[in-house]
């Protein structure tokens, strides 16, 4: 069966300066390949987090991505600013040269409230 990417929340609201968790779970780890978070869609989308060795300030994984039984690819964004507003997508890729996008979550819109 094809892997499904589940983003349970359609939207979240967070006060500027606070932290928020964007939830994403997969139904399978197969096929082999990375999971990445983007803000926006199309050519202009911005890479927010990749479950690899890359380092992303203010963004951390919520659960242990190296754990073999782990299907939770949620992220935490800390010290949220108004510029963080937008729709975030959890995207599953199949490993290759280059990697191929095979499934995306439905997106979670982040609203940033003035503190």
């Amino acid at each position: 069966t094809e892997v499904k990417v589940i983003q349970p929340e359609k939207s979240v609201s967070v006060a500027a300066g606070d932290s928020t968790v964007l939830n994403c779970t997969l139904t399978s780890l197969l096929p082999v390949g990375p999971i990445r978070w983007y803000r926006g869609v199309g050519q202009s989308r911005q890479l927010i987090y990749s479950f690899t060795t890359e380092h992303f300030p203010r963004v951390t994984n919520v659960s242990d991505a190296t754990k073999r039984s782990n299907l939770d690819f949620s992220i935490r964004i800390s010290n949220v600013t108004p510029e963080d507003a937008g729709t975030y997508y959890c995207v599953k890729f199949q490993r290759g040269s280059p990697d191929t996008e095979i499934q995306s979550g439905g997106g979670t819109e982040v609203y940033v409230l003035a503190k």
Epitope: D64, T66, K67, R68, S69
Partner: antibody
Framework: AVTLDESGGGLQTPGGALSLVCKGS????????MNWVRQAPGKGLEWVAG????????YYGAAVQGRATISRDNGQSTVRLQLNNLRAEDTATYYC?????????????????WGHGTEVIVSS | ALTQPASVSANPGETVEITCSGG?????YGWFQQKSPGSAPLTVI????KRPSDIPSRFSGSKSDSTGTLTITRVQAEDEAVYYC??????????FGAGTTLTVLG
């Protein structure tokens, strides 16, 4: 060569606490998940606890859940197991193990190296 | 716990297979040799089929469906030991098999 040296075993009192330390060398300690495994006299192997390479995530076996704390200091290349409220059934040889570049704490399929072990006897 | 046979036996030079089942759906199997009670185990296979550098090529591992297999070709007397498989269950907890005693006959 990879070496894992455990210390802190010995005779312990029921209800007391113990602290085991494992010192790793010969590999990039901060890149590998670590586990503690024990073996009671005449019994098989039992997983005790595990910790991810960065120390953010910890995992515990059912027999020690709520009594154990695993932690690591990547600067010192050490992993520590604290076990409280000791019972006679905690009597065992405790082994420190290293994961070989895959998996995390609890993923025993990834263990590629073992320490020599430290013996713990819980008795009054 | 993982399921593995209690004992297997083989003559020197023969091939022996030890199976292990019960690991989580996403997990692999590792194989650990213990030559005597109280002596430190030795990893002979990890991550299904990877072999530490000091382990002879006579030891190999594989996984088919949810069953892991340790294969020892050209068995030698020094291979006599208890072999444990290890993995993790679907909750992520580490699990071992009860151990398989390999007896080398003759």
């Amino acid at each position: 060569a990879v070496t894992l040296d455990e210390s802190g075993g010995g005779l312990q009192t029921p209800g007391g606490a113990l602290s085991l330390v494992c010192k790793g060398s010969g590999f990039t300690f901060s890149s590998h998940a670590m586990n503690w495994v024990r073996q009671a006299p005449g019994k098989g192997l039992e997983w005790v606890a595990g910790i991810s390479s960065d120390g953010r995530f910890t995992y515990y076996g059912a027999a020690v859940q709520g009594r154990a704390t695993i932690s690591r200091d990547n600067g010192q290349s050490t992993v520590r197991l604290q076990l409280n409220n000791l019972r006679a059934e905690d009597t065992a040889t405790y082994y420190c193990t290293k994961n070989g570049g895959c998996g995390s704490g609890g993923d025993l399929d990834c263990i590629d190296a073992w320490g020599h072990g430290t013996e713990v006897i819980v008795s009054s | 716990a993982l399921t593995q046979p209690a004992s297997v036996s083989a003559n020197p030079g023969e091939t022996v297979e030890i199976t292990c089942s019960g690991g989580g759906s996403n997990n692999a199997y590792g194989w650990f040799q213990q030559k005597s009670p109280g002596s430190a185990p030795l990893t002979v296979i990890y991550d299904n089929g990877k072999r530490p550098s000091d382990i002879p090529s006579r030891f190999s591992g594989s996984k088919s469906d949810s069953t892991g297999t340790l294969t020892i070709t050209r068995v030698q007397a020094e291979d006599e030991a208890v072999y444990y498989c290890g993995s993790a269950d679907n909750s992520g907890a580490g699990v071992f098999g009860a151990g398989t005693t390999l007896t080398v006959l003759g």
